[in-house]
């Protein structure tokens, strides 16, 4: 999906109002310095591409993020404010269903959510030069 035509300001507002709080809740009890940010993005469409991938695609050691509250609200925001997004997800979701059976918070998942927080922060500051 090409995120170029999304309403970035509305997605940002939804993130600041509620998604960010859900990410913090997920990470509660974890030190903010515990994980190094290794995933980066260069502009808002690129950030949303990386956020989508990290939120919804199962990875080794963390298959369950798509069932978390922040993921549900992220999906809602992308579907509402990115034209045609929900239609493109039909085939993609079917491929992921088997990997989503249980919700287990592993250290790998905590690291992945820490990366997500970094991507969202970068999304909110689009004019900053890439480090």
């Amino acid at each position: 999906y090409d995120f170029t035509n999304c309403d970035f300001e509305k997605i940002k507002a939804a993130y600041l109002s509620t998604i960010s709080k859900d990410l913090i809740t997920y990470m509660s009890g974890t030190k903010s310095t515990e994980f190094n940010n290794t995933v980066s993005c260069s502009n808002r469409p690129h950030c949303l591409t990386e956020i989508q991938s990290l939120t919804f695609n199962p990875t080794a050691g963390c298959a369950s993020l798509a069932k978390e509250m922040f993921a549900m609200k992220t999906k809602a925001a992308l579907a509402i404010w990115c034209p045609g997004y929900s239609e493109t997800q039909i085939n993609a979701t079917q491929a992921m269903k088997k990997a989503r059976k249980s919700k287990v918070t592993t250290n790998k998942c905590l690291e992945q959510v820490s990366q997500l927080q970094g991507l969202w922060r970068r999304f909110n500051r689009p004019l900053l030069k890439q480090q």
Partner: antibody, heavy 121, light 108 residues
Framework: QVQLVQSGAEVKKPGASVKVSCKAS????????MNWVRQAPGQGLEWMGQ????????NYNGKFKGRVTMTRDTSTSTVYMELSSLRSEDTAVYYC??????????????WGQGTTVTVSS | EIVMTQSPATLSVSPGERATLSCSVS???????LHWYQQKPGQSPRPWIY???TLASGIPARFSGSGSGTEFTLTISSLQSEDFAVYYC?????????FGGGTKVEIK
């Protein structure tokens, strides 16, 4: 304007199944999660689960797992909630409620009129 | 699961008086995830207050919401006849979504 219109009242025998429908109009159906909430007579509200019409993804309340199935038909903008192995305690009004951002806060912003399901032998 | 406890179960108030409804949450949640709904007999619930303190469209200013963490409050500064109803709090912080048992505001 957003409207959620539910199917009519049902009377079922214990052990049977019931399928309630909720037809949506006035918004982009595929883009909003739909929730199902029930209310037993004289009781409070109980969340059963939700479905994302765009891809059919579901999140269920563990209390109903194995008994509840939520599906959707995008061609008619309708979501369905099927509850099986009915017992008398399932007698309730069943509501569909859209999940949406209001002032960028996420909540159930529109509700159907409710469907009364009576389970009686 | 997060347990929502509302008190009192029934509140008897005279028109023009102030009403305070409480919602206690079993574990701390963000204020953005606490909502209130109003329900009248034979009707569907209606969104009333979003995110602890934001009034839904068309809700009169005599209603207000406050709180944080585990304690939240809905206040009606001067009760009008149309305010007599049941009010439910609800959290959207973690699954399963849960509602309080409701507070019935009745005419004294």
């Amino acid at each position: 304007q957003v409207q959620l219109v539910q199917s009519g009242a049902e009377v079922k025998k214990p052990g049977a199944s019931v399928k309630v429908s909720c037809k949506a109009s006035g918004y982009a159906f595929s883009s909003y999660w739909m929730n199902w909430v029930r209310q037993a007579p004289g009781q409070g509200l109980e969340w059963m689960g939700q479905i994302f019409p765009g891809d059919g993804e579901t999140n269920y309340n563990g209390k109903f797992k194995g008994r509840v199935t939520m599906t959707r038909d995008t061609s008619t903008s309708t979501v369905y909630m099927e509850l099986s192995s009915l017992r008398s305690e399932d007698t309730a009004v069943y509501y569909c409620a859209r999940g949406g951002y209001v002032n960028f806060l996420y909540a159930m912003d529109y509700w159907g009129q409710g469907t009364t399901v009576t389970v009686s032998s | 699961e997060i347990v929502m406890t509302q008190s009192p179960a029934t509140l008897s108030v005279s028109p023009g008086e102030r009403a305070t409804l409480s919602c206690s949450v079993s574990s701390s949640i963000s204020s953005s995830n606490l909502h209130w709904y109003q329900q009248k007999p034979g009707q569907s619930p209606r969104p009333w207050i979003y995110g602890t303190s934001t009034l839904a469209s068309g809700i009169p200013a005599r209603f207000s919401g406050s709180g944080s963490g585990t304690e939240f409050t809905l206040t009606i500064s001067s009760l009008q006849s149309e305010d007599f109803a049941v009010y439910y709090c609800q959290q959207w912080s973690s699954y399963p979504l849960t509602f309080g048992g409701g507070t019935k505001v009745e005419i004294k």
